[in-house]
Interface confidence: low
C-alpha cells in the first residue's frame, strides 16, 4: 500500500511567494509620472515576476512632521484619487496580486511616528484600518516600529482588527533593528505579524555565519512564518556586495517563509548609482530612456528592458526562482533542513512528504570549492540522493536539467545552485 | 465533473418573496474562490446577472435590483441560495444559477438547467 | 448598471463568416480582459465559447473566435454551419466587481 499522504498545512496568500514593496510611486514609475494610474499600467509587470502581494505607500496625506495636517484616511492628491486607487485594487485582484498598503504616519517626516504624540496618533491608525479594510486592501505596513513607544501591544491591537475583518489580511511590521531578542520580543505577542529587519544584513556575508543568523532565527521563532529580507525598506544593493546579489535571491526564495523584496531588487537597482537620486528611492530603470537628464548614463543590461531580453540576467534569474517558488510544495511549505559542507558553504534541503525535493548549496566564498556534502547530519525522512538535477545556478555556464553527482559538486565563486531530486520510499 | 441544479416554487404571488436554491455536486462550494452567481432571463429576452457571493461569503449585487436581492451560502448543504423580495410580473422569469471563477478566472464555466418562476396571483 | 450592446440579429449562409459586435463602456469591456461569449439554443442553458476575450475552452470548434478593440469586443465564426443558429450573448466583468451581459444576438444560418 502506499504511504499515506501528509495533510497540507493552512496557507494563507502571502505564504506562496514573494511581497515586492514600493515605497515611492514617483521613483517606482519614472520620470513624469508617479500615480495609482500609472501604477495599474504596471501591474503585468508585476505579474510577470509572480509575486503574491505589493506593499505600497505610504499614499495618504502627510506634512512632514504636522500631526494636524497628516490623514490617514485621505489620499495625497499627488498619487491620485479613492477612484485610482479602487481602480488598482480591482486591477490587482484580476491578476491575483494583494495590495498592502503602508500606513506609516509620518513618512514624509522625521520621526515616522511623530515621537511626541504617539498615542493620538496610534489611535489614527486604529481607525485608518477598518477604513481601508472597507477599502478592500489586503493588510498593512507600519515601519519603524521600535520608535513606537510600547510597539507589542499597539501591533497586537491593530493585528486583532485586521484578523478580525478577516483571516485572510496580513499585517506587516518593519524594524531598524537585527537583534534577535528584540524581534522575538515583537514577534512573541503576534501570532500571524510579518516582521521584516536588519537581521539577515548584520552579516560578515560568509557561508557558516549566515547558515548561523538562519537556524537561529528559525530556532528562536519556532514554527511561526518567518519573512526573509534584508532590511524593512532598503534595497539589496544598499547591503550586499555585487557578487553576493545572485546567491541571496536565491536564498529568499528558498528559505521558509516569504521572501520580501524592494522595487529595483530584481534588476539590482542601485541606490543612488545615479547622480541627484535620492538614496531611498532611486528611479526604477525601465529602459534606457528612464533617466533623460544625462544621456548616456544608463546602459541596456541595468534596465529591465534589457534584462527581459536576456536568460543569463538576475531579472530572469528572479522570474525563474519566483516561479519555482510559488509552485513547488517543497518550496511552499516544506521542511527545513540544514547540513554540513565545505568551508564558505550554506548547503540545505526543502522537502514535504512525497512531493519533489531541493537541494540548495550556497557558496559565499571568493575562491571555487568542492560542495563536501555530508548527509550524517539529515534525519532519515531527508536523505541526499547520489545525483540531483539541476534546476539553476546562479551563474551561468552550467545545463539546465542536467544531473549532477553530489559527492563530485564543484561550486564557482559565490555560485549558487538549486537541485531538485525526488521522493524516494 | 461540477453539476448545478435549481430548485424552489414555479409560481409566486406579487408582493412576495421568491426563494431558490442552487445545489452543487461534483465539488465543495467552499474549497476554491469561486463565484456562486444568479443570472435570469425574462421571456423571450436576454441574459440578466442578478448577483453573486464569493466562497469568502462577500456579495455583489446587479444595482437595478440591489435593494431586493439577498444570496447566501449553506455551506453544509453545498448550497446557495437567491431570495428575491416584492416580486412583481416584471421578475417572471427562468433563473439560472452559475459558477464563475476561481479567482481572476472571470466567466460563467458551469450553469444549472434553470427552472421557470412565474409571478402571478 | 446599463447592458452591453448587441446588434438584435445577424444572419449568413452556410460556410460563410459573421461577425458579432459587443459594445461597453470604460468600466467594463474597455477597462478588463474579462468579455466572455456565451451560446444558447432555445430552451438551454447557456454555453460558454469564449473567455478572457480570445481564449476558447476546450471542446469548442476553432471557427469560433474572439477579438477586442477598445470598448467594443467581437465574436467571429467562420465556416458558419446549421447547428450554429442561436442566440449569442456577450458579458464583461465591470470595475463595480459585477457582471453585465449584452442584450443578445439572433444568428440565422440560411
Known amino acids: 500500500r502506499a504511504p499515506r499522504c501528509r495533510e497540507l498545512p493552512a496557507q494563507k496568500w502571502w505564504h506562496t511567494g514573494a511581497l515586492y514593496r514600493i515605497g515611492d510611486l514617483q521613483a517606482f514609475q519614472g520620470h513624469g509620472s508617479g500615480n495609482l494610474a500609472g501604477l495599474k499600467g504596471r501591474l503585468d509587470y508585476l505579474s510577470s515576476l509572480k509575486v503574491k502581494g505589493l506593499v505600497l505607500g505610504p499614499l495618504h496625506k502627510n506634512q512632514k512632521d504636522d500631526v494636524a495636517q497628516t490623514d490617514l484616511l485621505q489620499i495625497d492628491p499627488n498619487f491620485g484619487s479613492k477612484e485610482d486607487f479602487d481602480n488598482l485594487l480591482q486591477s490587482a485582484k484580476k491578476k491575483s496580486i494583494r495590495v498592502i498598503l503602508d500606513l506609516t504616519p509620518n513618512y514624509r517626516g522625521e520621526n515616522l511616528w511623530f515621537s511626541t504624540q504617539v498615542d493620538s496618533v496610534a489611535t489614527k491608525v486604529k481607525d485608518a484600518l477598518e477604513f481601508w479594510l472597507q477599502a478592500g486592501v489586503d493588510g498593512f505596513q507600519v515601519r519603524d516600529i521600535e520608535n513606537l513607544k510600547d510597539a507589542s501591544s499597539f501591533l497586537a491591537e491593530w493585528e486583532n482588527i485586521t484578523k478580525g475583518f478577516s483571516e485572510d489580511r496580513l499585517l506587516i511590521a518593519g524594524t531598524n533593528s537585527s537583534d534577535l531578542q528584540q524581534i522575538v520580543s515583537l514577534l512573541e505577542s503576534n501570532k500571524d505579524l510579518l516582521l521584516t529587519s536588519s537581521y539577515l544584513s548584520d552579516s560578515s556575508f560568509t557561508g557558516e555565519h549566515t547558515k548561523s543568523l538562519v537556524t537561529q532565527y528559525l530556532n528562536a521563532t519556532g514554527n511561526r512564518w518567518c519573512s526573509w529580507s534584508l532590511s524593512q525598506a532598503g534595497l539589496l544593493t544598499s547591503f550586499l556586495p555585487a557578487q553576493l546579489l545572485r546567491l541571496y535571491q536565491l536564498m529568499l526564495f528558498t528559505l521558509p517563509g516569504t521572501p520580501v523584496f524592494s522595487y529595483g531588487d530584481e534588476i539590482g537597482l542601485k541606490a543612488a548609482a545615479l547622480p541627484g537620486q535620492p538614496v531611498e528611492a532611486p528611479v526604477m530603470l525601465w529602459d534606457e530612456s528612464s533617466f533623460p537628464d544625462i544621456p548616456g548614463a544608463v546602459s541596456a543590461n541595468m534596465t529591465v528592458k534589457g534584462q527581459s531580453e536576456d536568460p543569463g540576467s538576475l531579472l530572469s534569474l528572479f522570474r525563474q526562482l519566483s516561479d519555482q517558488r510559488s509552485k513547488e510544495r517543497s518550496l511552499l511549505h516544506g521542511d527545513f533542513h540544514t547540513f554540513s559542507s565545505g568551508p564558505g558553504l550554506f548547503s540545505y534541503i526543502r522537502h514535504w512528504d512525497q512531493n519533489e525535493r531541493f537541494l540548495v548549496v550556497l557558496n559565499f566564498g571568493d575562491v571555487g570549492l568542492s560542495a563536501g556534502l555530508q548527509a550524517s547530519d539529515l534525519p532519515a525522512s531527508a536523505s541526499l540522493p547520489t545525483k540531483a538535477d539541476l534546476v539553476l545556478s546562479t551563474q551561468p555556464g552550467r545545463e539546465e536539467g542536467s544531473p549532477l553527482e553530489l559527492e563530485r559538486l564543484k561550486l564557482e565563486p559565490h555560485e549558487g545552485l538549486l537541485l531538485r531530486f525526488p521522493y524516494v520510499a | 465533473q461540477v453539476q448545478l441544479q435549481e430548485s424552489g416554487p414555479g409560481l409566486v404571488k406579487p408582493s412576495q418573496t421568491l426563494s431558490l436554491t442552487c445545489t452543487v455536486s461534483?465539488?465543495?462550494?467552499?474549497?476554491?474562490?469561486?463565484?456562486w452567481s444568479w443570472i435570469r432571463q425574462h421571456p423571450g429576452k436576454g441574459l440578466e446577472w442578478i448577483g453573486y457571493i464569493y466562497y469568502s461569503g462577500s456579495t455583489y449585487y446587479n444595482p437595478s435590483l440591489k435593494s431586493r436581492v439577498t444570496i447566501s451560502l449553506d455551506t453544509s448543504k453545498n448550497q446557495f441560495s437567491l431570495k428575491l423580495s416584492s416580486v412583481t410580473a416584471a421578475d417572471t422569469a427562468v433563473y439560472y444559477c452559475a459558477r464563475a471563477g476561481p479567482k481572476w478566472e472571470l466567466w460563467f464555466d458551469y450553469w444549472g438547467q434553470g427552472t421557470l418562476v412565474t409571478v402571478s396571483s | 448598471q446599463s447592458a452591453l450592446t448587441q446588434p438584435a440579429s445577424v444572419s449568413g449562409s452556410p460556410g460563410q463568416s459573421i461577425t458579432i459586435s459587443c459594445t461597453g463602456t470604460?468600466?467594463?469591456?474597455?477597462?478588463?480582459?474579462?468579455v466572455s461569449w456565451y451560446l444558447q439554443h432555445p430552451g438551454k442553458a447557456p454555453k460558454l465559447m469564449i473567455y478572457?476575450?480570445?481564449n476558447r475552452p476546450s471542446g469548442i470548434s476553432t471557427r469560433f473566435s474572439g477579438s477586442k478593440s477598445g470598448n467594443t469586443a467581437s465574436l467571429t465564426i467562420s465556416g458558419l454551419q446549421a447547428e450554429d443558429e442561436a442566440d449569442y450573448y456577450c458579458s464583461s466583468f465591470t470595475s463595480s466587481s459585477t457582471w453585465v451581459f449584452g442584450g443578445g444576438t439572433k444568428l440565422t444560418v440560411l
Open positions: 478572457d476575450v480570445s
Open positions: 470604460s468600466s467594463d469591456v474597455d477597462n478588463y480582459n474579462y
Open positions: 461534483g465539488g465543495s462550494i467552499s474549497s476554491g474562490a469561486y463565484y
